[in-house]
């Protein structure tokens, strides 16, 4: 922001009324009036260019310093070209000297040169040559000097002429202030500019109404430079919750809008499924039946739990069941739907039921499922199972009701045994198998059926209570189709898949190869 100038002395504005002191009295400097642009103007002038050893002083009236620390002196003046006088006026000069003196009281007409300190020699950028003078073209020069720090109650300025032809048209003395400033929602008071060029006065700002320093942020500060300019802003204020920045102020959010935190963002419109907010709202309440999860941003619409999974099927495959379902028709307005599967088993004879989570195996953890299918295995044969698939989202925990669908399935067969070839020779195949432990107690015997591949007319059957068998009297280098099936009191269990195993050829009969 531009520096503010506080004027302490303005000769041009005073209309010749100031009555400055001239020394020696009646010689040298002289107050005169002229007409410029049809306006009367006053000036202090001296033009003793023909006589040498000039020492003419013009002293201002005493100027009260007030709060100024560094003063700026702006001079507007004209200087005639020494060559415009006959013979060049050998003693003629084209400069004058500027002095100042500080004092705590006005000395009146008591003028003492020794009290004055020289500020500078003032030289013109442009001199008034004869043609300019005759045409009344005033070649106005503007020079500015500064002095500081000042410490006394007031001061004088003085102008020393040493033989120039000069007219002072304007003497303006002022000091600079950094003006009152509103920036980053902080108010900085009008501040007197410091006196030392390298130093910057640090000024603390005050947050405007309804603005605060953000958490972890820096307090607002600015630096007032010597020239009255604000520099180096640090920190800021932000509008508090329920208020937004409008120009340089914080304004309450309009009804139907909200702002939930200290931030630079504007107020936002209340999202869907919220009640209309009052003025200055920090949040918008949810409509009845709609909720906001703790992690939901305030800008997100309020949501509700989903409806039940739309369609659920349970497909039995021996001692396994594949559960499949489709997403709920109503997601509740959320995308974070997960599914939970629970299992209940019932004994047909007694009708007794209980949870079966510990005895079954799921293809993936049954809680927090994101896919819409899961396979349940290790089911016991001749048991009734009921599976419940519950749909949940981020707000399901905020209500007591649940959204689920169930499917029941009866297991009539054991699970197909898993068959492995343990060893082979030219005339034998050693085969083993396994079924889930919960089903083993229900198995009476295992039936192993085998035949040559390509021979559909005959097959051989071997029964055993164990989990392995060696099939002898087989033809060398021949592929056999082998299937294992559990036999229970209730009948046959599910058969394993048909495996192809090949006996060794006579050349490689030296050992049993696996």
């Amino acid at each position: 922001a531009q520096g503010k100038e506080v004027v302490l002395l303005d000769f041009a504005a005073a209309g010749g009324e100031l009555g400055w002191l001239t020394h020696p009295y009646g010689k040298g400097w002289d107050l005169m009036q002229n007409i410029m642009n049809d306006m009367p103007i006053y000036m202090y002038s001296v033009c003793n260019v023909m006589s040498g050893d000039q020492d003419n002083w013009l002293r201002t009236n005493w100027v009260y310093r007030g709060e100024a620390e560094r003063i700026f002196i702006e001079l507007k003046f004209t200087v005639r070209d020494c060559n415009s006088f006959p013979g060049g006026a050998s003693s003629c000069k084209e400069t004058f000297n500027l002095y100042y003196a500080e004092s705590d009281l006005d000395y009146g007409t008591n003028f003492q040169k020794r009290l004055f300190t020289k500020i500078d020699t003032i030289a013109p950028d442009e001199i008034t040559v004869s043609s300019d003078f005759e045409a009344r073209h005033v070649k106005l020069n503007v020079e500015e000097r500064s002095v500081g720090p000042l410490t006394r109650k007031g001061f004088y300025l003085a102008f020393q002429d040493i033989g120039a032809c000069v007219a002072l048209l304007s003497v303006r003395v002022y000091y600079k202030k950094c003006p009152e400033l509103l920036q980053s929602l902080a108010r900085f008071p009008e501040t007197i500019a410091g006196s030392d060029a390298p130093s910057l006065a640090t000024v603390a700002g005050t947050c405007v109404d309804h603005a605060v320093v953000p958490p972890g942020g820096e307090e607002p500060r600015m630096h007032c430079a010597v020239d009255g300019e604000w520099l180096v802003p640090i920190g800021q204020c932000l509008c508090q919750a329920g208020y937004e920045k409008v120009e340089d102020a914080c304004q309450a959010c309009s009804p139907g809008f909200f702002k939930f935190e200290v931030s630079e963002s504007p107020c936002l419109e209340c999202p869907e499924h919220t009640l209309p907010s009052p003025e200055g709202a920090t949040s918008c309440e949810c409509e009845e039946g709609f909720f906001r999860a703790p992690q939901d941003p305030m800008s997100m619409p309020c949501t509700r739990p989903p409806s039940a999974p739309h369609y659920l099927t349970a497909v039995g495959m021996g001692a396994k069941v594949e559960l499949r379902w489709t997403p709920p028709q109503d997601s509740g307005g959320r995308e974070d739907i997960v599914y939970s599967v629970t299992c209940e088993q019932c004994w047909p004879e007694s009708g007794e039921c209980g949870p079966c989570e510990s005895s079954v195996r799921y293809s993936e953890p049954p809680h927090g499922l994101t896919r819409t299918s899961v396979t349940v295995s290790d089911l016991e044969p001749h048991m009734n199972y009921t599976f419940t698939v519950e749909a949940r989202n981020g707000v399901s925990g905020l209500v007591t009701s649940r959204s689920f669908r169930t499917a029941s399935v009866s297991i009539n067969q054991t699970e197909p045994p898993k068959v492995r070839l343990e060893g082979r020779s030219t005339t034998s195949l050693s085969v083993s198998w396994s079924i889930p432990p919960p089903q083993q107690s229900r198995v009476w015997k295992y039936e192993v059926t085998y035949r040559k591949k390509g021979d559909s007319n005959s097959y051989n059957v071997r029964r055993t209570e164990g989990f392995s068998v060696t099939l002898d009297d087989l033809a060398p280098d021949t592929t056999y189709l082998v299937q294992v099936q559990a036999l229970t009191q209730e009948g046959q269990g599910a058969g394993s898949k048909v495996h192809e195993f090949q006996t060794l050829s006579p050349e490689g009969s030296g050992s049993l190869a696996v």
Partner: antibody, heavy 128, light 107 residues
Framework: EVQLLESGGGLVQPGGSLRLSCAAS????????MAWVRQAPGKGLEWVSR????????HYADSVKGRFTISRDNSKNTLYLQMNSLRAEDTAVYYC?????????????????????WGQGTLVTVSS | DIQMTQSPSSLSASVGDRVTITCRAS??????LAWYQQKPGKAPKLLIY???NLHTGVPSRFSGSGSGTEFTLTISGLQPDDFATYYC?????????FGQGTKVEIK
């Protein structure tokens, strides 16, 4: 030494015309503002007209405006006053006068000029 | 136009006397005032310009003062050569008007 010598005066009838000349010597004529000042017999001085060093600007007293024309020829170091529609009240001694800013020891020129150097004058009589 | 009024219109004085002539302007002319001396049958001669500045070659017994509307010409010790008519002239405006003159005669 500065010298200004007027000529061209004489007797003329009302409504007639006359051209006065002023020959300058002893100074740089082209640096001077030149003027005509008249003095009616037994009366005071009256400024008539002025002309700038290079021929402009020109100013006239209200009493002669539109009738008199001031001019100069710097190559001939001569000032002129062409007087038309002469009246009885124009009867006077006409002085040519000069001003050199070099001799005006002021920092800012005055709104107009005074007259540092004068000729001896030439008498103009307007009578029937 | 600015009117210039001189007083007195004539005065009698002796050699060695201090003589003061006054010139009044009808409006302020700052210090833009000149004084001239004229002897019978001769052209005027410049004495003082800018109210108080002595023209080159003019004796120091002549002095001028004043500003605004009131001005004075002072001859501090009248000499025989000083008996003449004195005119003031303002050059604050283009009309450059003269006073009516003050005649200084031998007593």
């Amino acid at each position: 030494e500065v010298q200004l010598l007027e000529s061209g005066g004489g007797l003329v009838q009302p409504g007639g015309s006359l051209r006065l000349s002023c020959a300058a010597s002893g100074f740089t004529f082209s640096h001077y503002m030149m003027a005509w000042v008249r003095q009616a017999p037994g009366k005071g001085l009256e400024w008539v007209s002025r002309i700038g060093p290079s021929g402009g600007p020109t100013h006239y007293a209200d009493s002669v405006k539109g009738r008199f024309t001031i001019s100069r020829d710097n190559s001939k170091n001569t000032l002129y006053l062409q007087m038309n529609s002469l009246r009885a009240e124009d009867t006077a001694v006409y002085y040519c006068a000069g001003y050199d800013s070099g001799y005006d020891y002021v920092a800012v020129a005055g709104p107009a000029e005074y007259f540092q150097h004068w000729g001896q004058g030439t008498l103009v009589t307007v009578s029937s | 136009d600015i009117q210039m009024t001189q007083s007195p219109s004539s005065l009698s004085a002796s050699v060695g006397d201090r003589v003061t002539i006054t010139c009044r302007a009808s409006q302020s002319i700052s210090t833009w005032l000149a004084w001239y001396q004229q002897k019978p049958g001769k052209a005027p001669k410049l004495l003082i310009y800018k109210a108080s500045n002595l023209h080159t070659g003019v004796p120091s017994r002549f002095s001028g003062s004043g500003s605004g509307t009131e001005f004075t010409l002072t001859i501090s010790g009248l000499q025989p050569d000083d008996f003449a008519t004195y005119y003031c002239q303002q050059y604050n405006s283009y009309s450059r008007t003269f006073g009516q003159g003050t005649k200084v005669e031998i007593k």
